[in-house]
């Protein structure tokens, strides 16, 4: 008789999840010499231990501490790029500007990027059928708690000028319910961070509006200012040209506004 299984509203664990995490770990540690000491089997065991046999709506940051410890990584604190709702461009940017880092350029972020996972209470099985949806089911699910934990630590590690890339095509350019708005903004350290510089990425080719004046950007400015961190905002009118100029800063067309 098939055992009754909880049906969640979200997609199930990504297929071949254990193999994917292990393979990513091996690849990352090969590419990044400073992480060569990491034992990927131990990383997978710690990852698995965070959610296997636990109710997928009752996961805590504490569950991920063994994984956090194994994945400890020193990122240059003045080279951090945060992003919200514009992941692809942020990653394209750090692929070109190699000395800057998004969360997904760190080991733990790289391991989990675009993956879903959850287990079941009291069984060692991974649930490939469904996992809790943050809105419809519960917020303390394995994926959400993981990203909250690593995002908090990443923001806490930042110093000097911190950049954030925001999507100017969205109705809420700054969304206080996003990971950036709900976690990272509140964990920047005012003693260490001088300025949060927002880069608002324009979508339309003919869009010449100053999106730094958008009400949601003013909201971000207010939150940051209350935390005694300076705020700065730039419009990136031409993201394609922006990337091109990062690649070739000597290009004569790169002196004008991007």
């Amino acid at each position: 008789v098939p055992r009754w299984r909880q049906q969640w509203s979200g997609p199930g664990t990504t297929k071949r999840f254990p193999e994917t995490v292990l393979a990513r770990c091996v690849k990352y540690t090969e590419i990044h010499p400073e992480m060569r000491h990491v034992d990927c089997q131990s990383v997978w065991d710690a990852f698995k231990g965070a959610f296997i046999s636990k109710h997928p709506c009752n996961i805590t940051e504490e569950d991920y501490q063994p994984l956090m410890k194994l994945g400890t990584q020193t990122v240059p604190c003045n080279k951090i790029l945060l992003w919200s709702r514009i992941k692809d461009l942020a990653h394209q940017f750090t692929q070109v500007q190699r000395d800057m880092f998004t969360l997904e350029d760190t080991l733990l972020g790289y391991l989990a990027d675009d993956l879903t996972w959850c287990g079941e209470f009291n069984t060692s099985k991974i649930n490939y059928q469904s996992c809790p949806d943050w809105r419809k089911d519960c917020s303390n699910n394995p994926v959400s708690v993981f990203w909250k934990t690593v995002s908090r630590r990443f923001a806490e590690a930042a110093c000097d000028v911190v950049h954030v890339m925001l999507n100017g095509s969205r109705s809420k350019i700054f969304d206080k319910n996003s990971t950036f708005g709900s976690v990272e903004v509140h964990n920047l350290q005012p003693e260490k961070v001088q300025t949060l510089e927002a880069w608002v990425i324009h979508g339309g080719r003919e869009d010449s509006r100053d999106l730094c004046q958008d009400p949601t950007i003013k909201e971000l400015e207010s939150i940051i200012s209350k935390r005694n961190i300076q705020f700065s905002c730039k419009n990136i009118y031409r993201p394609d040209k922006f990337l091109q100029c990062v690649k070739n800063p000597e290009d004569s067309s790169c002196t004008s506004e991007i």
Epitope: P76, C77, A157, Q194, S225, Q230, S232
Partner: antibody
């Protein structure tokens, strides 16, 4: 290039007020906070606090609360340190330094003498 | 407040020699693998000049004769080789937590 230029030396009597200026150039003034550091004659450096040049919010170290005020004139890219009710122990060189401490003003000597 | 203890208070070094200045913090000044310790050089009548930021990073324009090392509570500034122009007072400073504090200084002279 980035420069912080401070106002000239001051000779004051005990009980008087002094206001020192620090004019910034070569960068966007509101992007970086401004620190103030005290150095008594022949002594070491003491951090007094800083002012957020974007919001104008000052943060004073405990030893510099009360008589010490940080302020701004953003349109002139200038930060100010005002010391009220001067005491003999306020005699020192005062430095402004951009947040991050890579750029410093040349210092302003405040002499307090009856 | 974090107390920084610098040693020695003064030292005399021969030209061309290697010298080290130590700075010990009363508690860790590390955060997520970054050490928030700066080193400055100050000559009489001048403002301090940033030499090393975050423990081991050489500030632009500073000669490579200067280097910094250490983590958590123990930090070292090394000058190798010492030149006549290095006569000055050297300070460490922590910026890990408010209030930012300085060491008491080390005066370097030439033998």
């Amino acid at each position: 290039q980035i420069q912080l230029v401070q106002s000239g030396p001051e000779l004051k009597k005990p009980g008087e007020t002094v206001k020192i200026s620090c004019k910034a150039s070569g960068y966007t003034f509101t992007n970086f906070g401004m620190n103030w550091v005290k150095q008594a004659p022949g002594k070491g450096l003491k951090w007094m606090g800083w002012i957020n040049t974007y919001t104008g919010e000052p943060t004073n170290a405990d030893d510099f609360k009360g008589r010490f005020a940080f302020s701004l004139e953003t349109s002139a890219s200038t930060a100010y340190l005002q010391i009220n009710n001067l005491k003999n122990e306020d005699m020192a060189t005062y430095f402004c330094a951009r947040k991050g401490f890579a750029y410093w003003g040349q210092g302003t000597l405040v002499t307090v003498s009856a | 407040d974090i107390v920084l203890t610098q040693s020695p208070a003064s030292l005399a070094v021969s030209l061309g020699q290697r010298t080290t200045i130590s700075c010990r913090a009363s508690e860790s000044v590390d955060s997520y693998g970054n050490s928030f310790m700066h080193w400055y050089q100050q000559k009489p009548g001048q403002p301090p000049k940033l030499l090393i930021y975050r423990a081991s990073n050489l500030e632009s324009g500073i000669p490579a004769r200067f280097s910094g090392s250490g983590s958590r509570t123990d930090f070292t500034l090394t000058i190798n080789p010492v030149e006549a122009d290095d006569v000055a007072t050297y300070y460490c400073q922590q910026i890990n937590e408010d209030p930012f504090t300085f060491g008491s200084g080390t005066k370097l002279e030439i033998k």
